[in-house]
């Protein structure tokens, strides 16, 4: 999607975690027919591997060709490998599909590092562990790519779930979810529960384990605890939201809230880290360093380059602070906060040297394109992309990794004034002069 290496994210083992499970609150919204409840056939339909993306099984063409597709709320193209590539076990073979239609148009998507290009067409698409429907959707058949596919990731394409405004080559190319809603009775919302394992998974464990759930067209109560809190989607391009305050262990970073959203804040399942604007990143790291000062870590750790390891089972979670992001609420002058633990922002990785240790990378990094709430945030929560009501909901995920002392949280309301002014207004530029 937008920039840099948007390494997708990590998955994990399903089910409720050991330890604390929050009681369900009773003051939830009234039921909306067809939108809430149980979606058994879609629960546990995601898999993945640490830092490499959550993917869902999809079928394309007639007869159906099965592919694993990365779920990405930070882009808007449905694009699949359509030619041999060393990292692909399989790819979309258009010539074998009787329902393929060529749009006779190319598409080129460059990133800061890497790119993909392909040919546009349409075909019949369905999601085996999704709604029981088939839709004709736009497909970018990737014929050439560089640093896009990931060796061993087990996915062969990408499902961009954001809005048409950021679709390539332009906003006239209808995204998959728009086609799905237009052609079927599926309600215009989806929800994601991404489950971090809390420890590294090898290839066979990934294939056997559950990485989470993508509920298409609804909300499944079994996937979260407590209440859902909603923040408005500021503008329908990325899933853009407004952050009004940031705290480290309850201490306000005390920055002008515009800085938190410079030049935007988005919810992006296709990014591993919590990415923060330069000034915010520097202030946050300074505060996290101070809070965890009982142990010293090399500079490379805070830059996300170096691992830090502890003897198996001895990770000192308690020395690391919780991080709270306050989001604009749906009600005027009201915000709510989402709080993540070090279990979310320290990403488990396999140490090449020894498997006796538990090793982690710092999964908060610097951004020049605004705040990106990637897997580090999403793995703590059940996230509802309520496109119909132009809002995003957060509740504590039933599968988030925590310990017996602390849990991720979604809490509110907090009286907060003039929140609209926390949003940054990106200057309108002639699109022809923009570089991706």
């Amino acid at each position: 999607t937008q920039h840099g290496i948007r390494l997708p994210l990590r998955s994990g083992l399903g089910g409720a975690p050991l330890g604390l499970r929050l009681p369900r609150e009773t003051d939830e919204e009234p039921e909306e027919p067809g939108r809430r409840g149980s979606f058994v056939e879609m629960v546990d339909n995601l898999r993945g591997k640490s830092g490499q993306g959550y993917y869902v099984e999809m079928t394309v063409g007639s007869p159906p060709q099965t592919l694993n597709i990365l779920v990405d709320t930070g882009s808007s193209n449905f694009a699949v490998g359509a030619a041999p590539h060393p990292f692909l076990h399989r790819y979309y073979q258009r010539q074998l599909s009787s329902t393929y239609r060529d749009l006779r148009k190319g598409v080129y998507v460059p990133y800061t590092q890497g790119k993909w290009e392909g040919e546009l067409g349409t075909d019949l698409v369905s999601i085996p562990h999704g709604p029981n429907v088939t839709v004709r959707a736009n497909i970018a058949a990737i014929t050439e790519s560089d640093k896009f596919f990931i060796n061993g990731s087990n996915w062969e394409g990408i499902l961009g779930l954001a809005y048409a405004e950021i679709a390539r080559p332009d906003d006239s190319l209808e995204p998959f979810f728009d086609s799905l809603v237009k052609q079927t009775h599926v309600p215009n919302l989806f929800s994601l529960q991404l489950c971090g394992a809390g420890f590294p998974l090898n290839q066979s464990e990934v294939l056997a384990s559950v990485g989470g759930s993508m509920i298409i067209g609804g909300i499944d109560h079994s996937l979260y605890t407590g209440s859902l809190w909603y923040t408005p989607i500021r503008r329908e391009w990325y899933y853009e939201v407004i952050i009004v305050r940031v705290e480290i262990n309850g201490q306000d970073l005390k920055m002008d809230c515009k800085e938190y959203n410079y030049d935007k804040s988005i919810v992006d399942s296709g990014t591993t880290n919590l990415r923060l604007p330069k000034k915010v990143f520097e202030a946050a790291v300074k505060s996290i360093k101070a809070a965890s000062s009982t142990e010293k870590f090399p500079d490379g750790f805070w830059l996300g380059e170096q691992l830090v390891c502890w003897q198996a089972g001895t990770t000192p979670w308690n020395i690391f602070p919780v991080i709270s992001l306050y989001l604009m609420g749906e009600v005027t002058n009201q915000s709510f906060r989402i709080t993540i633990l070090p279990q979310q922002y320290l990403r488990p990785v396999e140490d090449v040297a020894t498997s006796q240790d538990d090793c982690y990378k710092f999964a908060i990094s610097q951004s020049s394109t605004g705040t990106v709430m990637g897997a580090v945030i999403m793995e703590g929560f059940y996230v509802v992309f309520d496109r119909a009501r132009k809002r995003i909901g957060f509740a504590v995920s039933a599968c988030h990794v925590h310990d017996e002392f602390r849990t991720a949280a979604v809490e509110g309301p907090f009286v907060t004034l003039d929140m609209e002014d926390c949003g940054y207004n990106i200057p309108q530029t002639d699109e022809s002069t923009l570089m991706t």
Epitope: R245, D256, K258, F414, V415, T416, L417, D418, M419, C422
Partner: nanobody, 126 residues
Framework: QVQLQESGGGSVQAGGSLRLSCAAS????????MAWFRQAPGKERGGVAT????????YYADSVKGRFTISQDRAKNTVYLQMNSLKPEDTGIYYC???????????????????WGQGTQVTVSS
């Protein structure tokens, strides 16, 4: 630099009333939030009531809703806190505070305020 001076504190029986005043050295116009905070013995300073002077909009801590009223007299550069049905737990030092208007403002959070008065003691006995 805004200077703030509180007055009106004192001792009162539970159920009684007091009216606190906060005089500002220069008028805290539409660009300011004005607030009252209290600090009970051995506790942190907590928000009681806030006034967004531009709109005469008010915000109250749950514990004082329906009992306390914050208001202003622009002509006198003064903000008031009318306290009715006082309880022993309302005892503490009451501070007046001011802050320039800014986005993403948490009106009952003391860390958001730049200017403070010296405080006035309120004691409520049972």
């Amino acid at each position: 630099q805004v200077q703030l001076q509180e007055s009106g504190g004192g001792s009162v029986q539970a159920g009684g009333s007091l009216r606190l005043s906060c005089a500002a050295s220069e008028y805290t116009d539409s660009t300011y939030y004005m607030a009252w905070f209290r600090q009970a013995p051995g506790k942190e300073r907590g928000g009681v009531a806030t006034l967004a002077s531009r709109y005469d909009t008010t915000y109250y801590a749950d514990s004082v809703k329906g009992r306390f009223t914050i208001s202003q007299d622009r002509a006198k550069n003064t903000v008031y806190l009318q306290m009715n049905s006082l309880k022993p737990e309302d005892t503490g030092i009451y501070y007046c505070a001011a802050s320039p208007r800014r986005p993403g403002f948490f009106p009952l959070d003391p860390s958001q305020y730049n200017y403070w008065g010296q405080g006035t003691q309120v004691t409520v006995s049972s």
